[in-house]
């Protein structure tokens, strides 16, 4: 049987939520008029072909928007991008689509998202508010890589 994506809401430890602004995901403080995106996540169905003990390999999409998070090199550096893509199309591919995959690790209530295509690079938000989501190698410094997930519906 085919799985269905799980809708979740994500915020960081500073209670900032993800919002879509001009096709870019940014992290902003949760306020009355802020409408956070709902993230869809689904596990890769080829988990046996990926690294063990690194976390659960997942695809991350924006619920109802046909946009998925992916990692691609810009010059020498991996960058986080949004691409027009149906998350179920990625899920059903005959091989893992690594550029769109993240190892999801949970420790207590905290979650991290490590790029499968670029091991050691994690989804992060700058410690300052209102900044785009990025990929970083530097954990727990100027960037926050720990997020809280709340399952919806």
């Amino acid at each position: 049987k085919s799985e269905m994506p799980q809708p979740v809401s994500i915020q960081d430890i500073n209670h900032r939520v993800w919002v879509l602004q001009d096709q870019i995901l940014i992290a902003v403080p949760r306020k009355d008029r802020v409408s956070p995106v709902t993230i869809s996540l689904i596990s890769c169905r080829h988990v046996e072909t990926l690294e063990k003990d690194r976390g659960n390999p997942i695809y991350l999409g924006l619920n109802g928007l046909n946009l998925c998070l992916m990692c691609a090199k810009a010059g020498d550096q991996p960058t986080l991008q949004l691409k027009e893509k149906d998350i179920m199309d990625l899920y059903n591919q005959p091989e893992p689509v690594k550029s769109f995959l993240f190892y999801h690790s949970q420790s207590g209530r905290n979650s991290t998202f490590e790029s499968v295509a670029f091991p050691g690079w994690f989804i992060a938000v700058s410690s300052e508010g209102g900044c785009p989501l990025i990929l970083t190698q530097e954990l727990g410094k100027a960037n926050t890589t720990d997020f809280g997930l709340t399952m919806l519906f």
Epitope: H46, E48, E51, K85, N92, Q93, V97
Partner: antibody, heavy 121, light 109 residues
């Protein structure tokens, strides 16, 4: 320019093993999947298996499980196919191919020119 | 294991449209089989044409298109050219393994 350079023809005795190589240039094998395919005269193509060179995980067609072993050396950008307990049935041309995701699908976009293996006493 | 069957040979003329098909022994071919089409020319020269049933590989001429026709995968060459004379293989995914067809020898004369 992307190229897959395969090792030269091999003549080996029944019961022996052989290791074929496929060296990539113009791209990093860590960024893709490397497939191996067998072609016997007048018998079409058979999928042997594939390796993800970045992490070394493999998949094999059940028919080649135990016969073929796929490995990769990312430092030399080379994928390898080892065949063991050779018989005349293993006489064939063996191809490596890149199976890559681009835009919306996976494709066999580049192929080596094949290595001819002859098993004979 | 599934068997994938193709026409053994087809002949067409330059400028004509020709369709090659790919049948599965397990039933109808669907998008879940992610049909691939590969061209073989003399001297072991292989080129990937189509992936995921209907997606042309980068750099492949627009005259090549992939589709599902009835219960089979199909490769259509619209306006065949003499350089399209080759053997064409389809490959279908079944869960975690790939099965190739026996190939269709296409003659363009």
């Amino acid at each position: 320019e992307v190229q897959l350079q395969q090792s030269g023809a091999e003549l080996v005795k029944p019961g022996a093993s052989v290791k074929l190589s496929c060296t990539a240039s113009g791209f990093n094998i860590k960024d893709t999947y490397m497939y191996w395919v067998k072609q016997r005269p007048e018998q079409g193509l058979e999928w042997i298996g594939r390796i993800d060179p970045a992490i070394g995980t493999t998949r094999y067609d059940p028919k080649f499980q135990g016969k073929a072993t796929l490995t990769a050396d990312t430092s030399s950008n080379t994928a390898f196919l080892q065949l063991s307990s050779l018989t005349s049935e293993d006489t064939a041309v063996y191809y490596c191919a890149r199976y890559d995701y681009s835009g919306s699908s996976f494709y066999f976009d580049y192929w080596g020119r094949g290595t001819t293996l002859t098993v004979s006493s | 294991q599934a068997v994938v069957t193709q026409e053994s040979a087809l002949t067409t003329s330059p400028g004509e449209t020709v369709t090659l098909t790919c049948r599965s022994s397990t039933g109808a071919v669907t998008t879940s089989n992610y049909a691939n089409w590969v061209q073989e020319k003399p001297d072991h020269l292989f080129t990937g044409l189509i992936g995921g049933t209907n997606n042309r590989a980068p750099g492949v001429p627009a005259r090549f298109s992939g589709s599902l026709i009835g219960d089979k995968a199909a490769l259509t060459i619209t306006g065949a050219q003499t350089e399209d004379e080759a053997i064409y293989f389809c490959a279908l995914w079944y869960s975690n393994h790939l099965v190739f067809g026996g190939g269709t020898k296409l003659t363009v004369l």
